[in-house]
């Protein structure tokens, strides 16, 4: 806590500027007023406070600014922006795709990503949509990025904005975030030609149900085992060993190599240990031959 | 890892000199900024002296005219020349560094252990 003083009549500040960095912590909080401070935001990145009078200074805006600093302020931050808790973020109202590169580029090389991913969602409500200027700026400032947003947020993404969206910035997308995006890829890439199609979709297909795995094992695509790997169990889970083989073609030896990881190792418990021969792969752990299997889900709904 | 580390220090009597040196690895002074602060028992820690291309070279009022702040770029060194020392002097001295950014403002600061000055007779 900074303790309160008064202002010695020598030490009075009537602009910010690097004369400042003499003052003690004590002296900037009683010297230093906070109206004036965000009136020339502007000029305070330009001087090297230590850490430790940054605190002040962010004190004395979090004083003047209980409810959120206005986006006139949050612009100019600079460096000050890492002294920024998500706490402290969530009061803001950003709208401007300035304001978010300018902090964006502050933040890069320091350990900031829970800032970041709540700054992204301010500019997403403040924006009322994830439009394609803001996908634009998150791609190219901020990879991977995206991934950052709840599923709720990412529901805002027109599918025309899709397009803009680039493989690696998919990269740390969870399960739940796909299963938003991916309905968005396919409605965004449904006119194009099979090929340049699954180009397009793979990224997504984390997303993808069991029919439309299925649908694509009937494409000759050549699914490659990183993109199958990255399939919901679900929607592996019901695939033949015929539809595998189909979809992953030239690449189904590579399951050997995944046996033991899902999705591929619950994939073989569920297959027949004979169809699973036919491979030629030795994959092992299907189920032998003669047994009956019980689906007992279906059963219990029943009753 | 960037590493400060502060030498010089000791015990000197009123009126006398000391030459504090601060070595830095991992960053170069020349185009960020270096400075010396110093804190006295009980008292908060302030700037005593500071260079950077940037600001150029400032000093706190107190040791304007008795201190000089300098750099040896082979070295890779910030130097404190304190001349003229009185008790108000005695304190722990720290050498500090920050990265000057390319796209203007700064980044990373380090700070050394620090060095106690002991000024009395």
């Known amino acids: 806590d900074v303790e309160r003083t008064t202002c010695p009549p020598e030490k009075e500040v009537h602009e910010i500027d690097e004369s400042l960095i003499f003052y003690k912590k004590r002296e900037l909080e009683a010297c230093v007023d906070a109206a004036l401070l965000a009136a020339q935001m502007d000029r305070v990145d330009a001087i090297p406070f230590t850490y430790e009078q940054l605190d002040v200074l962010k004190h004395k805006l979090d004083e003047l600014y209980p409810q959120g600093y206005p986006e006139s302020v949050i612009r100019h931050l600079g460096h000050l922006f890492l002294k920024m808790s998500p706490e402290d973020i969530r009061k803001w109202n950003v709208t401007s795709l300035e304001t978010l590169k300018a902090l964006l580029k502050v933040s890069k090389g320091h350990e900031m990503s829970a800032q970041v991913a709540t700054l992204i969602d301010r500019v997403v409500v403040g924006r009322g949509q994830l439009d394609k200027d803001t996908v634009d700026t998150l791609t190219a400032f901020c990879p991977g990025c995206l991934c950052s947003l709840s599923p709720e947020r990412l529901s805002s993404v027109p599918p025309s904005v899709i397009g803009a969206v680039r493989p690696q910035d998919l990269d740390t997308c969870g399960p739940r975030q796909l299963d938003v995006l991916y309905p968005k890829a396919r409605l965004a890439f449904q006119n194009m030609s099979g090929s340049e199609y699954f180009v397009k979709i793979r990224p997504f297909l984390g997303g993808a149900p069991t029919e439309d795995v299925k649908a694509l094992s009937q494409q000759n695509v050549s699914m490659d085992l990183a993109t199958f790997m990255k399939l919901r169990r679900e929607a592996v889970l019901p695939l033949t060993v015929a539809e595998v083989q189909k979809l992953l073609g030239p690449h189904v030896e590579g399951l050997k190599v995944e046996e033991q990881h899902s999705p591929v190792r619950d994939w073989i418990l569920k297959q027949r240990q004979d169809d699973l021969d036919t491979l030629g792969l030795g994959l092992q752990g299907g189920i032998p031959n003669g047994y009956l299997i019980l689906d007992l889900s279906v059963r219990e709904a029943l009753s | 890892e960037v590493q400060v580390v502060e030498s010089g220090g000791g015990l000197v009597q009123p009126g006398g000199s000391l030459r504090l040196s601060c070595a830095a690895s991992g960053i170069t002074f020349s185009g960020n900024y270096g400075g010396w602060f110093r804190q006295a028992p009980g008292e908060q820690r302030e700037l005593v002296a500071s260079?950077?291309?940037?600001?150029?070279?400032k000093y706190a009022d107190p040791v304007k005219g008795r201190f000089t702040i300098s750099t040896d770029t082979a070295k890779n060194t910030v130097d404190l020349q304190m001349n003229s020392l009185g008790p108000e002097d005695t304190a722990v001295y720290y050498c500090?560094?920050?990265?000057?950014?390319?796209?203007?403002?700064?980044?990373?600061?380090?700070w050394g252990q620090g060095t106690q000055v002991t000024v009395s007779s």
């Open positions: 500090y560094a920050r990265v000057r950014l390319s796209r203007g403002g700064w980044g990373s600061e380090y």
């Open positions: 260079m950077s291309s940037a600001l150029g070279t």
